[in-house]
Interface confidence: low
């Protein structure tokens, strides 16, 4: 689990944000039907109630809003827009609410929104402008500090033609709105790759969780400007080897701890640089647990125990002898 801040610790220091004008502001102590409210805890819970839309009469004091386990389907632009705005809302949890579309500007008009959890929603459509506002040609910084997008991949029959990785990446980089993001969780999304330049647009990241995906290589991913990165979770992917460029970038990050467990490391001649690096680095947590998956003769060997003599590559066979 991630080191997400406790919702109650969020402040409301962000500037006042303009928002949509509701006819009558809700009464301060009003609680929407099908919800539980605690003004003392600044918390509203509308959980497992099969809601199909966001309640319009949320109390203005709400700082922590749980809308989990519902049937929201679509979050339109301005889904949380009120006048006066929900200026205190800092933590919003929409996990497991059967969302399949998050439209542009869905989270506009929430000036203090620090933590957003959209996990466990099959997002067939995530607008490029979901986190960056609903203007077509203008973007501005989002107040988000923590964005949790674990297991948001839709089933295959609901996926758009374009790449899911690309759709998510576009939402993360649009308008450079997430420059202040400290925590990003993208676990369990079947990612085959991380689109180039995404991380370059997220320079404030402290915690990045890419675990339980299908990442095969990090060759085209640059971590260079993530100078604040403290935790990088790459467990349970399909990584075969980390190449010199990646190793150098990780080593150059001043505070980082990298988690690499449960990847199918290929222990052949291409692994030599990584093994050498592992033996000297303090960056990798639990490095003594890393073991080879291939080739068969190396299976379960501990990477730290390998030497260069162990890491050979089979000679290239003549075409007539090659097998698939």
């Amino acid at each position: 689990s991630s080191p997400t801040s406790s919702a109650s610790s969020f402040s409301s220091s962000a500037p006042f944000l303009a928002s949509a004008a509701s006819a009558q502001p809700p009464l301060p102590d009003q609680c929407p039907a099908l919800c539980e409210c605690s003004e003392a805890a600044r918390t509203v819970k509308c959980v497992n109630r099969n809601l199909t839309e966001v309640p319009t009469d949320l109390p203005l004091y709400v700082r922590n809003l749980f809308l989990t386990g519902n049937q929201l389907a679509v979050l339109p632009a301005g889904a949380f827009a009120r006048r006066p705005p929900l200026a205190e809302l800092a933590a919003l949890n929409l996990s497991g609410s059967r969302l399949d579309e998050v439209r542009a500007g869905a989270f506009e008009h929430l000036p203090s929104l620090r933590q957003l959890d959209l996990s466990h929603n099959p997002l067939a459509y995530l607008s490029p402008f979901a986190f960056s506002g609903s203007n077509a040609s203008i973007s501005a910084p989002s107040p988000l500090v923590e964005l949790i997008l674990n297991h948001i991949v839709p089933p295959d029959d609901k996926r758009q033609n374009r790449s899911f990785e690309g759709m998510v990446a576009a939402a993360l980089v649009a308008g450079r709105a997430l420059q202040g993001l400290h925590l990003l969780e993208l676990a369990s999304n079947h990612f085959l790759y991380l689109p180039r330049d995404v991380l370059a647009q997220l320079p404030s990241l402290r915690y990045l969780d890419l675990s339980n995906n299908s990442l095969v290589s990090l060759t085209y991913v640059s971590f260079r400007n993530l100078t604040h990165l403290e935790s990088l979770h790459l467990e349970d992917n399909a990584l075969k080897v980390l190449h010199n460029g990646t190793l150098a970038e990780l080593q150059g990050l001043p505070h980082v701890r990298v988690f690499l467990d449960n990847n199918p490391w290929v222990c052949d001649c291409h692994m030599a640089d990584m093994v050498t690096w592992l033996k000297q680095t303090e960056v990798v947590q639990g490095k003594d647990r890393l073991t080879c998956a291939f080739p068969e003769k190396m299976r379960n060997r501990v990477l730290l125990e390998l030497n260069s003599a162990d890491l050979d590559c089979d000679p290239i066979l003549p075409p007539s002898l090659q097998t698939s």
């Epitope: 006042f16 303009a18 339109p76 301005g78 439209r103 609903s134 203007n135 077509a136």
Partner: antibody
Framework: QVQLQQSRPELVKPGASVKMSCKAS????????ISWVKQRTGQGLEWIGE????????YYNEKFKGRATLTADKSSSTAYMQLSSLTSEDSAVYFC??????????WGQGTTLTVSS | QIVLTQSPAIMSASLGERVTLTCTAS???????LHWYQQKPGSSPKLWIY???NLASGVPARFSGSGSGTSYSLTISSMEAEDAATYYC?????????FGAGTKLELK
């Protein structure tokens, strides 16, 4: 490219109602807010209200509440504004505009309303 | 409501002259939500400067914007003929959204 095409000029009698349209193209209609703005001849700009077509949330300037009605038809990507109980003070150009917190970045060409007996 | 007062109401400037238009709010406005529009006769307004100081697409670099709190300004470093227009400031900070009455900038 983004376009907002507004309906033709209207000449109506005092006390009547009028409904004008704003047809959007070049973008996903439900993704963006549409606002309506009034401009009397030689005068400044006055915000009437805004509609979120995706959720049909509607917000009015108190001054126009009760006389202005904003609607949106997603199937035709068209926003509408109806004004009722018209007086000569309502004679103006009415613009629809798309945008949000960071300004209205696209505007229709305006619909001229003349209220005269 | 927030009242935006623009001054001067009408201003004449010569080619090449530096021009400053001001917009004063009756109460503090977050600078992210203070914008300027340019409008020419018979045309719709165009977003000109957004969030106090950001030039909208296609706006010449001779334009700039600044300000905070209740005091904002639009500056043209060197007046050109095509800059003659009416300029409106606009706040999207509190409902109702409001515009200034406009400054009509004429070529002397």
């Amino acid at each position: 490219q983004v376009q907002l095409q507004q309906s033709r000029p209207e000449l109506v009698k005092p006390g009547a109602s009028v409904k004008m349209s704003c047809k959007a193209s070049g973008y996903t209609f439900t993704d963006y807010v549409i606002s309506w703005v009034k401009q009397r001849t030689g005068q400044g700009l006055e915000w009437i209200g805004e509609i979120y077509p995706g959720s049909n949330s509607i917000y009015y300037n108190e001054k126009f509440k009760g006389r202005a009605t904003l609607t949106a038809d997603k199937s035709s990507s068209t926003a509408y504004m109806q004004l009722s109980s018209l007086t000569s003070e309502d004679s103006a150009v009415y613009f629809c505009a798309m945008g949000g917190n960071y300004g209205f970045d696209y505007w229709g060409q305006g619909t001229t309303l003349t209220v005269s007996s | 409501q927030i009242v935006l007062t623009q001054s001067p109401a009408i201003m004449s400037a010569s080619l090449g002259e530096r021009v400053t238009l001001t917009c004063t709010a009756s109460s503090s406005v977050n600078s992210n939500y203070l914008h300027w529009y340019q409008q020419k006769p018979g045309s719709s307004p165009k977003l000109w400067i957004y969030s106090t100081s950001n030039l909208a697409s296609g706006v010449p670099a001779r334009f700039s914007g600044s300000g905070s709190g209740t005091s904002y300004s639009l500056t043209i470093s060197s007046m050109e003929a095509e800059d003659a227009a009416t300029y409106y400031c606009h706040q999207y900070h509190r409902s109702p959204l409001t515009f200034g009455a406009g400054t009509k900038l004429e070529l002397k």
